[in-house]
């Protein structure tokens, strides 16, 4: 039961995380730009990975996409790539994990296959979460190092006027959404990997040796019972008619230690 719960919870947490990564990638509020002493009028700027927006004090809002690729910083392109890779891996992970869920029966899929799929999806979620966290962190670092506080001194020729304008860049809501979503996806992935260990089959069959007596004896193998709940196909004592001591290696199946679930 614990395995199913861990797997299910991991799936849900990852699902929420990936939804958050998608939301963060699409959001416009990755950074905001404020002028400390704006000499013109109250205008608020905020930027995302794909477009820049302006909101006026009147409530008017307008967004404009970054139509050029060449003029964009390499760091921004890297952040875009990381977020997209995170989304793609997460989406594939979700698809794989749906089929891996223990509570869903698909044909005669064995536990070993489900365990492998759970591990695969778990690793995908972990990488997806790391991509999102890395992308958001790279963007945050870019803001701090390159843009955080840019000061411009304005000189005019005739009047001899000097004005200093400071542009302050602050972290937008999308950064926090991205960090939290990446963390959730990562946690969900770890939970899936933990669940995988519980799903993995273990060899619990005991090798039995049969001895033949004189004549046309029939050797019973008391050790030939499968160490399981009795739901397997090899639950009866098998008779060996050909004589000679041998081990029972025929018709082996690999039951899960969690067949009780």
């Amino acid at each position: 039961m614990a395995v199913t719960a861990c797997q299910g919870l991991g799936f849900v947490v990852s699902l929420i995380g990936i939804a958050g990564i998608i939301a963060a990638t699409c959001m416009d509020q990755w950074s905001t730009q404020d002028l400390y002493n704006n000499p013109v009028t109250a205008v608020f700027n905020y930027q995302g990975l794909w477009r820049s927006c302006v909101r006026e004090s009147s409530g008017f809002t307008e967004c404009r996409g970054y139509f050029t690729l060449l003029g964009l910083p390499a760091m921004l392109q890297a952040v875009r790539a990381l977020m997209i890779v995170g989304i793609v891996l997460g989406a594939i992970g979700l698809l794989v994990s749906i089929f891996a869920l223990k509570c869903i029966r698909i044909g005669s899929m064995e536990d070993s296959a489900k365990a492998n799929m759970t591990l695969t999806s778990g690793i995908m979620f972990i990488v997806s979460g790391l991509c999102a966290i890395a992308g958001v962190s790279v963007f945050a670092n870019m803001l701090v190092t390159n843009f955080w506080m840019s000061t411009a001194n304005m000189y005019t020729g005739m009047g001899g006027m000097v004005q200093t304008v400071q542009t302050r860049y602050t972290f937008g809501a999308a950064l926090f959404v991205g960090w939290v979503a990446g963390g959730l996806t990562l946690i969900g992935g770890v939970m899936m990997c933990i669940a995988c260990r519980g799903l993995a089959p273990e060899e619990t069959n005991y090798k039995a040796v049969s001895y033949h007596a004189s004549g046309h004896s029939v050797a019973y193998k008391p050790g030939g019972f499968k160490a399981s709940t009795g739901f397997g196909s090899n639950t009866k004592n098998k008779k060996i008619y050909d004589g000679g001591a041998r081990t029972e290696d025929e018709v082996q199946s690999y039951p899960s230690k969690h067949d009780y679930v």
Partner: nanobody, 122 residues
Framework: QVQLVESGGGLVQPGGSLRLSCAAS????????MGWYRQAPGKGLELVAA????????NYADSVKGRFTISRDNSKNTLYLQMNSLRAEDTAVYYC???????????????WGQGTLVTVSS
Amino acid sequence: QVQLVESGGGLVQPGGSLRLSCAASGSIFSINAMGWYRQAPGKGLELVAAITFGGGSTNYADSVKGRFTISRDNSKNTLYLQMNSLRAEDTAVYYCNADLLVGGFPRRNVYWGQGTLVTVSS
């Protein structure tokens, strides 16, 4: 590099009219707002009028309300100031000011023109 080029200044009689223009050029991503400031001889800088480029919200100094009209042409990145009923106290150097987003991944900054002289005298 961004440039603001003003034009339209000159000598005019009291009660007359002038139209100032300010053209913004360079690697402009978008214009937040633009405005006109003036500096009379021996005085400080004062805001004359300002306009946001998106919504077109305007702001005027009390001394010019009803006489001056600010407007913009978004397609040309140009700012205008129509000055009517000019007075002697309007004599000053008029500076164009622009709050711009510049570059591919735009950075916000404020730019100033070199100024154009308006003299109101009989």
